[in-house]
């Protein structure tokens, strides 16, 4: 808390300008009128205030707007936004996409902070829906934001946004989200040639259906085990031993280390043992020779 002291003679701020960088904390508190600050917030960003000075300015705004800042002030917070806590932001009602963009710009290049997460949450709740413009904005600033959306929300993500997604941005996506994102990625990258296409689509393959995996197996892609282990089990099960061998290329040897983990474990159980033996990896658990395989799920469907 800054002590209340009288403003020295001739120091009363008539406008928010660069001369304020010379003011000590107590001078800013005493000589800057909060209402003046609020009306000239757009100037604050153009002045290299120290963090301590920004604390004083924030304190003045907090006193002026105890119930939360109006959007006219929020839009021009600039680097003062970095001083806000999630609790401060929860008091705001942000409805303008321009305001959202202005504040995301301040945090550009940094990881998503709790402040930004709270801001986005407030914005989406205030709008009542995640429209295309909002999604475009959010995915442009934070491609990783995709994984925090529900499959329903993801359905309105434009394929063009997929180009900005980096592999690590999908790390927290679950299979249901990848089911929605994969077809969009397939569409976005459809004009790329084989090897380039695989590099781009690889991160999204957790949502790929069997037929797409079969098609990839014909293209000498040499999928790594880490990617294979993230594939949908139901998409992997119908693949033949030959198809998996082509899909993984030299990485096929890694199956041995993963034979107890899904989807490899479940896939092994569906393969004929003599087919598995052709890999020469010592994979065990396949269907013994001479056994007939009945697809019970098909039988149930017919009855």
């Amino acid at each position: 808390e800054v002590e209340k002291t009288a403003c020295p003679s001739g120091k009363k701020a008539r406008e928010i300008d660069e001369s304020l960088i010379f003011y000590k904390k107590w001078e800013l508190e005493a000589c800057v009128d909060a209402a003046l600050l609020a009306t000239q917030m757009d100037r604050v960003n153009a002045i290299p205030f120290t963090y301590e000075q920004l604390d004083v300015l924030k304190h003045k705004l907090d006193e002026l707007y105890p119930q939360g800042y109006p959007e006219s002030v929020i839009q021009h917070l600039g680097y003062l936004f970095l001083k806000m806590s999630p609790e401060d932001i929860r008091k705001w009602n942000v409805t303008s996409l321009e305001t959202l963009k202005a504040l995301l710009e301040v945090n550009k290049g940094h990881e998503m902070s709790p402040q930004v997460a709270t801001l986005i949450d407030r914005f989406v709740k205030g709008r009542g829906q995640l429209d295309k413009d909002t999604l475009d904005t959010l995915t442009a600033f934070y491609p990783g934001y995709l994984c925090s959306l529900s499959p329903e929300e993801l359905s309105s993500v434009p394929p063009s946004s997929i180009w900005a997604v980096r592999p690590q941005d999908l790390d927290t996506c679950d299979p249901r989200q990848l089911d929605v994102l994969y077809p969009k990625a397939r569409l976005a990258f459809q004009n790329m040639n084989g090897s380039e296409y695989f590099v781009k689509i690889q991160s999204f393959l957790g949502g790929a259906p069997t037929e797409d995996l079969k098609a990839l197996s014909q293209q000498n892609v040499s999928m790594d085990l880490a990617t294979f282990m993230k594939l949908r089990t139901d998409a992997v099960l119908p693949l033949t031993v030959a198809e998996v061998q082509k899909l993984l290329g030299p990485h096929v040897e890694g199956l041995k280390a993963e034979e107890r983990h899904r989807p490899v474990r479940d896939w092994i159980l569906r393969q004929r043992q003599d087919d598995l033996d052709t890999l020469g990896l010592g994979l065990q658990g396949g269907i013994p020779n001479g056994y007939l395989v009945l697809d019970l799920s098909m039988q149930e469907a017919l009855s």
């Epitope: 001369s19 010379f22 290299p48 120290t50 963090y51």
Partner: antibody
Framework: QVQLVQSGAEVKKPGASVKVSCKAS????????INWVRQAPGQGLEWMGI????????KYAQKFQGRVTMTRDTSISTAYMELSSLRSEDTAVYYC????????????WGQGTLVTVSS | DIVLTQPPSVSGAPGQRVTISCSGS????????VSWYQQLPGTAPKLLIY???QRPSGVPDRFSGSKSGTSASLAITGLQSEDEADYYC???????????FGGGTKLTVL
Amino acid sequence: QVQLVQSGAEVKKPGASVKVSCKASGYTFTGNYINWVRQAPGQGLEWMGIINPHGGDTKYAQKFQGRVTMTRDTSISTAYMELSSLRSEDTAVYYCARWHHGTWIFDYWGQGTLVTVSS
Amino acid sequence: DIVLTQPPSVSGAPGQRVTISCSGSSSNIGSNYVSWYQQLPGTAPKLLIYNDNQRPSGVPDRFSGSKSGTSASLAITGLQSEDEADYYCSSWDRADGSYVFGGGTKLTVL
């Protein structure tokens, strides 16, 4: 056109003080802040502080606090930088530079003043 | 005391493209504009780029600046012999209210 002309080279003994001047012309002297930046031989640039010629307010880099004094004489459009308790490490070229409002940059520089501290 | 980190030297042949990186922190580059200065041998520094990526009039468009997070870079395309100089990045630091410079990068045109 805007010009910043600095005083000539100085040789000082350790413990002494030096006062470098910077005469401005071609613009309203009180309308732009003046910064002082130094550069030791073969080294990089180092910011020392800033003065507002309008009111004389100053802000110094922590490293020079207590040793540097920046002043100005508006009647002759001149800024001064005085550095006391000189040591050999203070041997450097000292530049004055005009601060351009709104962009936090030094748009015009003086030609530099070499200060040599030697016993 | 150097707050912004630059490579000590870079080089390139005439006509080539070179980039000079500048790494800082959230209190300087991360929350303030970046400027670049060019210092030819024996002369005062000259402003090259301001506000992260703006060029003052008279500076050729071969020079461009960019910034992301707490790092900035200067790119020079179509390298010319007269570009041989020291280049400094700089920014205001909000932690202590000082102006900070990088250690400088010597550009050699081969």
